[in-house]
Amino acid sequence: HHHHHHASQPCPDPTAPPNGHISPVQATYVLKDSFSVFCKTGFELLQGSVPLKSFTAVCQKDGSWDRPIPECSIIDCGPPDDLPNGHVDYITGPEVTTYKAVIQYSCEETFYTMSSNGKYVCEADGFWTSSKGEKSLPVCKPVCGLSTHTSGGRIIGGQPAKPGDFPWQVLLLGETTAAGALIHDDWVLTAAHAVYGKTEAMSSLDIRMGILKRLSLIYTQAWPEAVFIHEGYTHGAGFDNDIALIKLKNKVTINRNIMPICLPRKEAASLMKTDFVGTVAGWGLTQKGFLARNLMFVDIPIVDHQKCATAYTKQPYPGAKVTVNMLCAGLDRGGKDSCRGDAGGALVFLDNETQRWFVGGIVSWGSINCGGSEQYGVYTKVTNYIPWIENIINNF
């Protein structure tokens, strides 16, 4: 061993970098001796600008170390990622992104909300981390069910909608005119019969939002990425399970004229009892027998399920019957109804507790004689399909 010391030169004493220490500390370092550098918490080993997890240098025969000592640099989490539909504020100081710096994410007020508090800290692993330990960005979820509409409007028997009344209303243009309801910033709820045959021919489906006038040249355009028709729906064999979802290629920006309708809460059933009033809007046929130019709406009461089923037994609709997956709305004497061209639109109700509107029904079918006495409008009962809707959205 003594000979081994003389055969090679000792290496110079290593100097610990600022905010770091060396181990082991020895009086001398000779051939094959090594040392490692460790940084204080909140600092990392950097060789230039490149991070290292560990550093060990070995003493060589010529009395030099085999690599240069890196620096211990303060952890820099870097500029935080942009938050879609939100923004970030630097709390610690302008553009400060180093260890223990704090930032605050916020969503665009009024139209988006965040479930967490949005506070993130630059931690020792170099990631912006929330108080719950999450390293992913918070999510700005669209607010749903806000409307300037107040119940009491007297598109059969209806009246014109005003801007912001039905911001979830979606116009579907294909071979025929239909409607849908925005339920997320990239999902539209509609009737299966309105999009039947569109699962493959999606490019023929023109989706428009943020409009009142059906023929308006100023609108927000969306295109379908996928169409999901309920597996229990059979085209031409009644309207049971008449529900579908359209996944949009791109998220739409939420504003006062484009906003999702809320899905019903578990308590929604108590708000949709017989004689409770819902509202439906659409560009479908009016009393005059033509498609409406302006978005029309009507407030209509829910009809007793048995009464509705009986009415359609007396005056059957070819190939259709009222099932438990449907709800009916209208007046015994008639005069208020949805009609052809309204299909897929939402029958909505105000949740008094949250003061938000939610979708209870989807315009599905009814007598050819829209608004006729005891010819109630039949709607897909959305509360029966919440698991189906959530399953598709969550698994897409």
Epitope: G48, S49, V50, K53, R67, P68, F127
Partner: antibody, heavy 114, light 107 residues
Framework: QMQLQESGPGLVKPSQSLSLTCTVT?????????WNWIRQFPGNKLEWMGY???????SYNPSLKSRISITRDTSKNQFFLQLNSVTTEDTATYYC???????WGQGTTLTVSS | DIVMTQSQKLMSTSVGDRVSVTCKAS??????VAWYQQKPGQSPKALIY???YRNSGVPDRFTGSGSGTDFTLTISNVQSEDLAEYFC?????????FGSGTKLEIK
């Protein structure tokens, strides 16, 4: 012996996305170092695109920041390059390499053409 | 971005000669410079890191020197297999940048 191997399509159309995989054998990508993507244009100009470090942190060339994403799958010991909205200017040989550049893949040639 | 300038695009030398390839950084990069050798049809191979530290397996006829802005790769006793293009790279500051390359031809 440590090796890096790039894989991906040889041809991509303009405006599409490019996805490349670097499979590392003989060394765990979580053990240490930064794992880089570097490309070499016709004429031999080299450009560093970005890296993903042992901890999963990324650093990108600002000239590509809006289009690039580097991710990894630690269970497969792979890291990935995604480059969006490619143009003919992205035609190059793409290499994955370990810092200090002591190990490089053999490169994969990408042509962007309609 | 830091610009790494290799002013000599092509250098001619003979077997057994000593040749120096230079690289200039547009700003101070300390010793955070690497040198690569690329032979035709091959991927680059690391020769030197941190300005003067030889990578393992690299013949000791390759020597790196310099700090700050001026760096040199010296090949003493040039061999025919050294016919290649040589690139410098700074890793001091992101983005990491490369020189444009110097081709070495053997007379």
């Amino acid at each position: 012996q440590m090796q890096l191997q790039e894989s991906g399509p040889g041809l991509v159309k303009p405006s599409q996305s490019l996805s490349l995989t670097c499979t590392v054998t003989g060394y765990s990508i979580t053990s240490d170092y930064a794992w880089n993507w570097i490309r070499q244009f016709p004429g031999n100009k080299l450009e560093w695109m970005g890296y993903i470090s042992y901890s999963g942190r990324t650093s990108y060339n600002p000239s590509l920041k809006s289009r690039i994403s580097i991710t990894r799958d630690t269970s497969k010991n792979q890291f990935f390059l995604q480059l969006n909205s490619v143009t003919t200017e992205d035609t190059a040989t793409y290499y994955c390499a370990r810092h200090y550049g002591d190990y490089w893949g053999q490169g994969t040639t990408l042509t962007v053409s309609s | 971005d830091i610009v790494m300038t290799q002013s000599q695009k092509l250098m001619s030398t003979s077997v057994g000669d000593r040749v120096s390839v230079t690289c200039k950084a547009s700003q101070n990069v300390g010793t955070n410079v690497a040198w690569y050798q690329q032979k035709p049809g091959q991927s680059p191979k690391a020769l030197i890191y941190s300005a003067s530290y030889r990578n393992s397996g690299v013949p000791d006829r390759f020597t790196g020197s310099g700090s700050g802005t001026d760096f040199t790769l010296t090949i003493s006793n040039v061999q025919s297999e050294d016919l290649a293009e040589y690139f410098c790279q700074q890793f001091n500051t992101n983005p990491l940048t490369f020189g444009s390359g110097t081709k070495l031809e053997i007379k």
